[in-house]
Interface confidence: low
């Protein structure tokens, strides 16, 4: 029998799969590649023509509890003279990640997967105006 | 693990840290947010450090499709539409968490996996190294 998976394609279920109650999934939160490190160019948030700052958000009922969000420093972009050029726009670049949310209902605890939109950094773009028909 | 304040009226058996294995609801909260960056904005074309988006598909992972950015140029696009090599297009990378099927092919058993993705590109002033 084919079993639907998260993401709408199908797999033949191997015999070795652990039993899981209906409507839920088993999740091991021991992270694979936990010690992987980002190897971005140094200080790009300050050297960018669309510079950004970082803010750390903390939630003890979320795993991971710490999520870093970027915020563009300017509406415009920084030109060669180091001045803000408002004919261009600094815009956020976003990426989805998954977190595990812990919910307390009375004395019982349940866990929920959640998609979180993280602002990763900013880029400089030419603006556009859309006219809706 | 993560320490949380415990409801004082609850029995002390509850672990303050996240357990290593949890049963989670199959419904993912905020599941229907845009996952295709080509559809959600055209920044990749309008940026002064434009990038191409490459589809990375893995059926053993959720989400099974992830888009990877690759900067189109070493330099940045100037006001005349030409590549200026006095500036650099560099990728913005981010660690994200995904679900990896464990054991493989199992429909409802996963492990969290951290992966590094390039989300887009930004234009930076280059670091010039002077050799003594």
């Amino acid at each position: 029998r084919k079993i639907p998976k998260v993401g709408h394609t199908f797999f033949q279920k191997p015999e070795s799969c652990p039993p899981v109650p209906g409507g839920s999934m088993k999740l091991d939160i021991g992270i694979i590649n936990e010690n992987q490190r980002v190897s971005m160019s140094r200080n790009i948030e300050s050297r960018s023509t669309s510079p950004w700052n970082y803010t750390v958000t903390w939630d003890p009922n979320r795993y991971p509890s710490e999520v870093v969000q970027a915020q563009c420093r300017n509406l415009g972009c920084i030109n060669a003279q180091g001045k803000e050029d408002i004919s261009m726009n600094s815009v956020p670049i976003q990426q989805e990640t998954l977190v595990v949310r812990r919910k307390h209902q009375g004395c019982s605890v349940s866990f929920q997967l959640e998609k979180v939109l993280v602002t990763v950094g900013c880029t400089c773009v030419t603006p556009v105006i859309h006219h809706v028909q | 693990g993560i320490t949380i304040p415990r409801n004082p009226g609850c029995p002390n058996s509850e672990d303050k840290n996240f357990p290593r294995t949890v049963m989670v609801n199959l419904n993912i909260h905020n599941r229907n947010t845009n996952t295709n960056p080509k559809r959600s904005s055209d920044y990749y074309n309008r940026s002064t450090s434009p990038w191409n988006l490459h589809r990375n598909e893995d059926p053993e992972r959720y989400p099974s499709v992830i888009w990877e950015a690759k900067c189109r140029h070493l330099g940045c696009i100037n006001a005349d539409g030409n590549v200026d090599y006095h500036m650099n297009s560099v990728p913005i990378q981010q660690e994200i968490l995904v679900l990896r099927r464990e054991p493989p092919h199992c429909p409802n058993s996963f492990r969290l996996e951290k992966i590094l993705v390039s989300v887009g590109c930004t234009c930076v002033t280059p670091i010039v190294h002077h050799v003594a």
Epitope: N89, V128, H130 | N34, S41
Partner: nanobody
């Protein structure tokens, strides 16, 4: 959950101007919009601005007369309404949404303010 509070509505003569404000608090959004509902009519799209502030969208009926903008922080959105007409009379709502596709579809907005009444009459 995003909380939205509108202000700036009121009574104005035809040809006059008003500036509406909408203060947002809470989680991020992809777009913020102004929608309006005239007495006995369906709610309709007026204008929207992307969360980054660089993309703006207007309904044909207000193009050239209304300008949508937001502050640097993205917390407050504005609608500058010039050359107002009696047919602009409505309750104006501020709302947020995820995604930039079909911003003119009022059903796609998730969080709504309580609305502010704009009356254009001589």
């Amino acid at each position: 959950e995003v909380q939205l509070v509108e202000s700036g509505g009121g009574l104005v003569q035809p040809g006059g101007s008003l500036r509406l404000s909408c203060a947002a608090s809470g989680r991020t959004y992809d777009a913020m919009g102004w929608l309006r509902q005239a007495p006995g009519k369906e709610r309709e799209f007026v204008a929207a601005i992307s969360g980054s502030g660089d993309d703006t969208y207007y309904a044909d009926s207000v193009k050239g007369r209304f300008t949508i903008s937001r502050d640097n922080s993205g917390i407050t959105m504005y609608l500058q309404m010039n050359s107002l007409r009696p047919e602009d009379t409505a309750v104006y709502y501020c709302a947020t949404r995820r995604g930039l596709y079909y911003v003119w579809d009022s059903n796609d907005y998730e969080n709504w303010g309580q609305g502010t009444l704009v009356t254009v009459s001589s």
